[in-house]
Amino acid sequence: MAVTACQGLGFVVSLIGIAGIIAATCMDQWSTQDLYNNPVTAVFNYQGLWRSCVRESSGFTECRGYFTLLGLPAMLQAVRALMIVGIVLGAIGLLVSIFALKCIRIGSMEDSAKANMTLTSGIMFIVSGLCAIAGVSVFANMLVTNFWMSTANMYTGMGGMVQTVQTRYTFGAALFVGWVAGGLTLIGGVMMCIACRGLAPEETNYKAVSYHASGHSVAYKPGGFKASTGFGSNTKNKKIYDGGARTEDEVQSYPSKHDYV
């Protein structure tokens, strides 16, 4: 039960995280005009990964896309790449994790296969979250550097009567959305990896068959026995013979230590 809960929660947390990463990537407010200690202007500037916008006090907002690819700063291109890689990995991870969910039954999929898929999706979520956090952090670092550079420029070259106001940019809402979303995706991935440990069989999966002697009710169990998940009959438990021979799972199921994770 705990394994399913951990897996399900990991999936939901990752889903929210990836939705957040997509939202952050699409948002225009990665950097916003710094209003502190600045003359009050009737124009508010903000920029995203794909376009820059200007909101006028009168109510008009104008956005212009970055229609050049080569003319953009390498750092911005890197941030775009990191966010896109994060989204792609997260989307694939979600797809894989849907089939890995314990509560969803697909044909006669083995527990070991589900465990592998859970682990794969977990790793994908972790990498996706790290990509998003890295992308947002690189952009934030770029902003901090530019902020102090423009602050220095504000106090130079003002010997003349005419002054030019330098627009400084600070952290926009998208950065915080990206950090939180990346963190959630990362947590979701870790949870999936933890759930995977509970799904994986510890030893080689032998079929334990009980032989019913004609006069006795003693069952002979060869080899080691499979760690049960404690969730009723497994989809792969099939009758071997119509007669006295049954798979061990059909006789009784024992709780394993993994049920208490």
Epitope: Q33, P39, V40, T41, A42, V43, N45, Q47, S52, C53, V54, E56, S57, S58, G59, F60, E62, R64, V162, Q163, T164, V165, Q166, T167
Partner: antibody, heavy 117, light 113 residues
């Protein structure tokens, strides 16, 4: 079509307060800002202040202490209130709609305000 | 506050002539975000409210004749009337629409001989 109409004209005694209502039609106050401008007789234009779509206001720094602009979106009305009027506040008061570039693209006909005892 | 200085204060020209008037601001009105200058030109005829001619320093308002042209950037701006008509008799104002409080120039009075 877009229209703005100021209430008035008004005769005010010195040190009294002034209230003008600008009733708009053809656009919504939740989408566009309204600005106020005055023009003393034979003189140039003076920007008084503005109330923007979100309800935030900006004022002429020289008049800020005695000027107040508010609005009622449902009634499509903008209100200008000015305290402690003096004779040099005698002017034609205009309300105008904010457009592209924060410019005023539509103007009311103006209302004459005379401050005299 | 931003100071807007207009020159000349008055102009007397004959119909068909080319006219230029200047407007200078004490600070740059150029917004780096969209590379637009927040300077507006108005025309006010006697006994009428002002009429918007040009915004963003060079964009003509719809319905304004193309003989009116705005130019300039940063702190120096110009309004040009390529061929003055009798109906252009008015006072022309420039306005800072970038910094609060918005401020007007003192105006340029255009008179026709």
């Amino acid at each position: 079509q877009v229209q703005l109409k100021e209430s008035g004209p008004v005769l005010v005694a010195p040190s009294q307060s002034l209230s003008i209502t600008c009733t708009v039609s053809g656009f919504s106050l939740t989408t566009y800002g309204v600005q106020w401008v005055r023009q003393p007789p034979g003189k140039g234009l003076e920007w008084l202040g503005a109330i923007w779509a979100g309800g935030n206001t900006n004022y002429n720094s020289a008049l800020m202490s005695r000027l107040s602009i508010s609005k009622d979106n449902s009634k499509s009305q903008v209100f200008l209130k000015m305290n402690s009027l003096q004779t040099d506040d005698t002017a034609i008061y205009y309300c105008a709609k904010g457009g592209y570039g924060n410019a005023m693209d539509y103007w009311g006909q103006g209302t004459s305000v005379t401050v005299a005892s | 506050d931003i100071v807007m200085t207009q020159s000349p204060s008055s102009l007397t020209v004959t119909a068909g002539e080319r006219v230029t008037m200047s407007c200078k601001s004490s600070q740059s009105l150029l917004n780096s975000g969209n590379q637009k200058n927040y300077l507006t030109w108005y025309q006010q005829k006697s006994g009428q409210p002002p009429k918007l001619l040009i915004y963003w320093a060079s964009t003509r308002e719809s319905g304004v004749p193309d003989r009116f042209t705005g130019s300039g950037s940063g702190t120096d701006f110009t309004l040009t009337i390529s061929s003055v008509q009798a109906e252009d008799l008015a006072v022309y104002y420039c306005q800072n629409d970038y910094f609060f409080p918005f401020t007007f120039g003192s105006g340029t009075k255009l008179e026709i001989k």
